[in-house]
Every structure is written in structure tokens, then in C-alpha cells.
Amino acid sequence: ELCDDDPPEIPHATFKAMAYKEGTMLNCECKRGFRRIKSGSLYMLCTGNSSHSSWDNQCQCTSSATRNTTKQVTPQPEEQKERKTTEMQSPMQPVDQASLPGHCREPPPWENEATERIYHFVVGQMVYYQCVQGYRALHRGPAESVCKMTHGKTRWTQPQLICTGEMETSQFPGEEKPQASPEGRPESETSCLVTTTDFQIQTEMAATMETSIFTTEYQ
């Protein structure tokens, strides 16, 4: 089941998927001056069995200067409601991504691929958020969003990350960050993908080093 909407945006933050659930589609988009080859796939599809998942179909682009110079049309099949836009960066994979059952890793780039990727996410997909450079996390609650099905409709959960550019915050002397939450998180908010704790460690490292752990920037 495709998710009806985009994952929520958070001010001064970007999100990315660490891995893509089976059923996820990625549009075959070509950069300006290129187009999908005739009889080429409209999209790549994450498919698999219990032991292995991979992307079906290959995206291929050819120069639109050769022969007919028809304008490139973005494939938008009727049933594909979901549009995810990403900027391509170097494909550096998070370590735990490959071992997730029922998930595909980030597909490698194809020749003359467009600078933005459009994903069509499915129910159960999780995306992770991080403050952009120049901003820091004032509050680092669950920094993820999950596409869920409730009452026959899909809905993304609201991430609780607050990014601020203000340096003048009141840190109370002698106060330490809690090691763990005093209460267990409700079941609906847990996930077997990447634990919040793992991601918090990653984002804290990233914040310290002022480098992004994300390989793909979502807009």
C-alpha cells in the first residue's frame, strides 16, 4: 500500500530513508538533455523474498539530442500518488542498512540520472531526520517518521525534532542528559528498523563532527 502523503517536513532539517521497504518505487528520471530509453522502465521496484531484497528493473537514459528531441516527461502513473524528492550525493551506506530483511539499500546511480530522486514509499517505511548545517537540535525526541495505516488511511507520524539556529539557550549547570527514558515507549512508536538510540548516537556524532550522516538530501 502506497503512502498518500510526503513524510512531514521539519524546519531546518532533512530526512532520509536508511533502507527502502519492499514495494517502494523509484522513478526513472534523466537529467536535462537526456530521456528514458524507448521501452525502458518507468520505475525501479524494491522486491524480494524472505532472504533477499533487490531493485527490479534498471533505469536507463539516452541523449534526447539523438533523433526526436521530445520534451522529457516525468513518469506519473495514476496509482503513484507519492512523490519523494532527493538530491543525489555519494552513495555512502549506513552500516546496518544492508542487513534489514525485506528492505532494499539505496540503488546505485545510473548514467545521466536526474539530480533529484522521486520515491514512492509504502506503509511501514521509516525515514530519519537531522538538523541541517548551521542548526542544532534543541530537542532530540524521536527523530523519525513512520508511514502507518489507520482507519483505512495512511499517515506519517510526527517527528519530535526541533532544530534551532539560536545559540543563546539556557543550559542548566550540572544537568545531564538522561541515559534512558524512565518509561518504555508505547509499542506504536517502536520500530525494528534502526532504534532511536542508535540514530541519536549517529546524529549526536554528526552534530559534533558537523558532518552529515545522510547520503541523500530530501527536500
Epitope: 512531514p8 525526541g141 534551532t164 539557550t169 538522561p178 524512565p182 518509561e183 512508536e189
Partner: antibody, heavy 115, light 107 residues
Framework: QVQLVQSGAEVKKPGASVKVSCKAS????????MHWVRQAPGQGLEWMGV????????IYAQKFQGRVTMTRDTSTSTVYMELSSLRSEDTAVYYC????????WGQGTTVTVSS | DIQMTQSPSSLSASVGDRVTITCRAS??????LEWYQQKPGKAPKLLVY???TLAEGVPSRFSGSGSGTDFTLTISSLQPEDFGTYYC?????????FGQGTKLEIK
């Protein structure tokens, strides 16, 4: 279910301080930041500031800078808002509200400043 | 600071009417906007977040739309319990300012 329960009404003299509490239950306290919003009689809503229940960091609206202090106690899942140097214009209902989208609110605490 | 301006400041409508309240931000706030309903003597209640997502338990007659600087809250068919004051608020950056409110009365 999620509940935010605030402390009772307060009557204060000008120049004094007031400390309002907001006790959270029904969810993991440190997952959600807490905001404070006030409403003077017959007026609209005014955002005062936000505290991270996770780190204790807070950001205050410029108007209240130097007069407001927001703290939290993770052991009791309680957030506090202290406003000092009270004046009559601070007479209002003070609310705590949860998270990025203010999805749950406390019932409000009436603070009256009068000589 | 970002200013939020609501219109109208008050309105009176009949049960079954379609009601529209607008909110304008002084700068682009993307879709970082919430709508709240407040009844006299009560705390505000979240209706819509991120400009168009209906909060849990809110009747489907309420809907939100808009992006950038112009936003709308629509009640498709007004019910007697919909009276109260409606506020918009942004969460783009601190301070998170509110609109001045729209008082909705039932005719």
C-alpha cells in the same frame, strides 16, 4: 492516555515571582519538548518559550528573556515555568503544551498579579 | 519575528454553512502551520497540523490548506459545537507566534 496536569491558581503581588508546574503522564516524557503559552483575560494566545525535556535546554521569547526560567524534572515527568518581577500585565492563564505541534495542552493555571 | 494575521476577526454563521477562516504569514513558512479551536474557559485544542493534516479525533468536516504565506481552515458543514475562537500558529522558527484569533458564533 496523555495528560498534562498543571498546578493551581496563584495570586501574587507586583515584583514577586510565580512558579507553575505541568506534570505529564501517559507517554514517554523525554520524547516531547514542552512549550509554555499564556493568555491574558479576553486576549489571544502568546508563546513564551520551549524547553527540551531531553536536554533541559530552553529558548524563550524575547519579551520574557531575563524574567522567565523553564526547568524540568525527569524523575517526576514535570516541567516548571518560573516568571519573576511580576507586574499586573502578567495576569493571565498560563498553559503548557506538548511537542512540535502542541497536540496536548494542560488545563491552564490562572495567575493574578494584584497589589 | 513572523507576524500571523487572521481574517475575519469574527463571524457569525448558521448550522450547515461552509465556513472559511484565513491566516497570512508575514514571510514564507512553508507548511509549518497549525490551527487550534478554543472554547471559553478551556485550553486550546489542536485541529490541523502541518497546514493540512487533521489531528486525531477531529471530525472530517474540518480541513486545512495552503503553503508559503496563505493558509485556510475550512469547516464544510458547520455544527452547533463548532462555536469558539480559532487560532493559527506557525512553528517555522522561534518565537512561534499565533494569529490574533477568529471568533466564530453560531447564528
Amino acid at each position: 492516555q496523555v495528560q498534562l496536569v498543571q498546578s493551581g491558581a496563584e495570586v501574587k503581588k507586583p515584583g514577586a515571582s510565580v512558579k507553575v508546574s505541568c506534570k505529564a503522564s501517559g507517554y514517554t516524557f523525554t520524547d516531547y519538548a514542552m512549550h509554555w503559552v499564556r493568555q491574558a483575560p479576553g486576549q489571544g494566545l502568546e508563546w513564551m518559550g520551549v524547553i527540551s525535556t531531553y536536554s533541559g535546554d530552553a529558548i524563550y521569547a524575547q519579551k520574557f528573556q531575563g524574567r522567565v526560567t523553564m526547568t524540568r524534572d525527569t524523575s517526576t515527568s514535570t516541567v516548571y515555568m518560573e516568571l519573576s518581577s511580576l507586574r499586573s500585565e502578567d495576569t493571565a492563564v498560563y498553559y503548557c503544551a506538548r511537542g512540535v505541534t502542541f497536540d496536548y495542552w494542560g488545563q491552564g493555571t490562572t495567575v493574578t498579579v494584584s497589589s | 519575528d513572523i507576524q500571523m494575521t487572521q481574517s475575519p476577526s469574527s463571524l457569525s454563521a448558521s448550522v450547515g454553512d461552509r465556513v472559511t477562516i484565513t491566516c497570512r504569514a508575514s514571510q514564507d513558512i512553508s507548511n509549518y502551520l497549525e490551527w487550534y479551536q478554543q472554547k471559553p474557559g478551556k485550553a486550546p485544542k489542536l485541529l490541523v497540523y502541518n497546514a493540512k493534516t487533521l489531528a486525531e479525533g477531529v471530525p472530517s468536516r474540518f480541513s486545512g490548506s495552503g503553503s508559503g504565506t496563505d493558509f485556510t481552515l475550512t469547516i464544510s458543514s458547520l455544527q452547533p459545537e463548532d462555536f469558539g475562537t480559532y487560532y493559527c500558529q506557525h512553528h517555522y522558527d522561534t518565537p512561534y507566534t499565533f494569529g490574533q484569533g477568529t471568533k466564530l458564533e453560531i447564528k
